[in-house]
């Protein structure tokens, strides 16, 4: 009986253990799942930080390869090359220089091309009504890019184009043939035909850069 | 002894059980242990990669800010005005207009100060280079900025800036008083001395705008 | 029909002026190059001046540079040169002629208008 | 200053076939074209030929031009009494910007 009272306290002792184990391992379970939950949802935010993170990275590099652009731009634009050059007239969409020596209509046209030129052509009314006024202070007849083989030949541009008929009449030498050919020139507001031998004024004309305008 | 024997086979079960509870604690105690570190682990991440997303959102705000005041410049250089206005000539730092109509000298004047411009001064022999040649295709005389009241008083530029003696010599009616003053024009590259009430061309002339170039 | 008028030769000392004028008729005047050529007593044709339509080109003798003024008025239909420090080799009938262009064949002319230069 | 040169007289029978020649430089002729004026004398002269072979209406073709490099010819076939006369070439000379004329040569048909 006294073995038997020993063993029923160690049997009380062993279950008090044992519950009390059961409680700590119960304890420690919840303590896991918590624990569990925590780290999914640090993994949760881990992610969520990630992703941020690589959408900033992306919007960063638009935004630098924008600046870049932008500085490559702001560099062309602030060279802001004028819309024409020095001495030259800038006038809607074309500069125009007058020439201040007089040459044959060959050697002017090679003149305006030495400057990125062409010799002057006339599109509109409104182009020949600017002519004519720029031109209005002087008495001396100006080559315009304006030229023809002999008079069965149509009146050619530079760059191949007819001559409009409604623009202008062209008077003088049109019935006459010459060896260099017949070349147009304006002179106080109207447009003459005249052997291109001829040494005159002339007047070059190119596109004005108007990118940053 | 059947009692003895029966709680021995209880107390050898809960020492097992108690083991078994035992063993589990311990490992779910390392398991806790790891679950600890690992979740240390992931808050310092988390850390980190909040740090980083809190330095691209700075750098960001900063590229913004750059992209910003980028296209603002952009904004202002691109009106870039030309340095000069349509039909004016760009030379050097001066715009030059070349009048299309007849004017005595005061109208002129007008003329050129509705077009935020004063009639032409010449300060050098490069200025005078300048227009003699713009002007070589012309015969027409061209008021310039200079007069003065009669003989006894020196000539005045526009903006009261006597004329150095040494630019060029004024020929024609120097010694003449007028009513209405004497004015110098400029015809064929020489300076000429006439009453101001005469009709002739004139030349404007304004600071070239060259902030952007 | 075309017709060229000159006027205003005559007798003039050395050193003097003279204006001629030739009056054009039965063309389009603006639309042709003029030129004055004279014929001085028993010599060939020598060249004096041209004027383009508009009188744009004026080109002159070497003979004469200086001294000889051409002009035209396309209202009047006329023809001008002004020739002042006349010398006696100045002395010759002065014609007038039309070309269709500056530098091409004169393809009609006037019947000239004598010019003598003598003290 | 003469720049073109002519035979100062040529002479033919009549019926003949007689030729000017008419002489310049690179300058002119050899540039430009060349025109022939026919002066009757105490006339005003009269163009006989234009763009170095060209006939005016009126103009016989017993007249002809011709051109080779910086010479120039007139040729006149079937001579008449009436062709006698002064002949004067003349073109444009590009370098000093001036008509230039021969100095004429004078027909004479014989007979």
């Known amino acids: 009986s006294q073995v038997s009272n020993l063993l029923k306290q160690q049997q009380t002792n062993l279950t008090h253990q044992k519950n009390k184990l059961e409680g700590q391992i119960s304890a420690r379970q919840q303590a896991e799942e918590a624990s569990q939950e925590s780290q999914n949802e640090l993994k949760e935010m881990i992610e969520t930080l990630a992703w941020k993170l690589n959408e900033k990275s992306k919007e960063q590099m638009e935004l630098h390869h924008q600046n870049l652009n932008l500085q490559e731009t702001l560099k062309r634009v602030a060279n802001c090359s004028a819309p024409c050059p020095q001495d030259w007239i800038w006038h809607e969409e074309n500069c125009y220089l007058f020439s201040t020596g007089s040459f044959n209509w060959e050697k002017s046209q090679e003149k305006c091309l030495s400057l990125d030129a062409k010799l002057l052509k006339i599109n509109s009314t409104a182009d020949l009504d600017f002519i004519q006024q720029a031109i209005s202070y002087s008495s001396f007849p100006f080559w315009m890019g304006l030229s023809r083989r002999n008079p069965s030949y149509p009146w050619l541009w530079e760059d191949g184009s007819p001559l409009m008929p409604h623009l202008f009449r062209i008077r003088g030498a049109v019935s006459q043939t010459y060896p260099s050919g017949t070349c147009a020139y304006i002179q106080r507001g109207a447009v003459y035909a005249e052997n291109c031998i001829l040494a005159a004024f002339s007047i070059c004309q190119k596109k004005a850069n108007l990118r940053a305008q | 002894s059947q009692v003895s024997n029966l709680l021995k086979q209880q107390q050898t079960n809960l020492t097992h059980q108690k083991n078994k509870l035992e063993g589990q604690i311990s490992a779910r105690q390392q398991a806790e242990e790891a679950s600890q570190e690992s979740q240390n682990e992931l808050k310092e991440m988390i850390e980190t990669l909040a740090w980083k997303l809190n330095e691209k959102s700075k750098e960001q705000m900063e590229l913004h800010h750059q992209n910003l005041n980028l296209q603002e410049t952009l904004k202002r250089v691109a009106n870039c005005s030309a340095p000069c206005p349509q039909d004016w000539i760009w030379h050097e730092e001066n715009c030059y207009l070349f009048s299309t109509g007849s004017f005595n000298w005061e109208k002129s004047q007008e003329k050129c100060l509705s077009l935020d411009a004063k009639l032409l001064k010449i300060n050098s022999t490069a200025d005078l280079d300048f227009i003699q040649q713009a002007i070589s295709y012309s015969s027409f005389p061209f008021w310039m900025g200079l007069s003065r009241r009669n003989p006894s008083y020196p000539w005045l530029w526009e903006d009261g800036s006597p004329l150095m003696p040494h630019l060029f010599r004024i020929r024609g009616a120097v010694s003449q008083t007028y009513p209405s003053g004497t004015c110098a024009y400029i015809q064929r590259g020489a300076v000429y001395a006439e009453n101001c009430i005469l009709a002739a061309f004139s030349i404007c002339q304004k600071k070239a705008n060259l902030r952007a170039q | 029909q075309v017709q060229l008028l000159e006027s205003g030769g005559g007798l003039v000392q050395p050193g003097g002026s003279l204006r001629l004028s030739c009056a054009a008729s039965g063309f389009t005047f603006s639309d042709y190059a003029l030129h004055w050529v004279r014929q001085a007593p028993g010599k060939g044709l020598e060249w004096v001046s041209v004027i383009s339509y508009a009188g744009g080109f004026k080109f002159y003798a070497d003979s004469v540079k200086g001294r000889f003024t051409i002009s035209r008025d396309n209202s009047k239909n006329t023809l001008y040169l002004q020739m002042n420090s006349l010398r006696a080799e100045d002395t010759a009938v002065y014609y007038c002629?039309?070309?269709?262009?500056?530098?091409?064949?004169?393809?009609?002319w006037g019947q000239g208008t004598l010019v003598t230069v003598s003290s | 200053d003469i720049v073109l040169t002519q035979p100062p007289s040529v002479s033919g029978a009549p019926g003949q076939r007689v030729t000017i020649s008419c002489s310049g430089s690179?300058?002119?002729?050899?540039?430009?074209?060349v025109s022939w004026y026919q002066q009757l004398p105490g006339t005003a002269p009269k163009l006989l030929i234009h763009s170095n072979s060209h006939r005016p209406s009126g103009v016989p073709d017993r007249f002809s031009g011709s051109k080779s490099g910086t010479s120039a010819s007139l040729a006149i076939t079937g001579l008449q009494a009436e062709d006698e006369a002064d002949y004067y070439c003349?073109?444009?000379?590009?370098?000093?910007?001036?008509?230039?004329f021969g100095g004429g040569t004078k027909l004479t048909v014989l007979g």
């Open positions: 002629a039309r070309s269709p262009g500056l530098t091409s064949y004169h393809d009609s």
């Open positions: 003349q073109s444009w000379d590009y370098e000093s910007e001036r008509v230039v």
């Open positions: 690179s300058s002119n002729i050899g540039s430009n074209y």
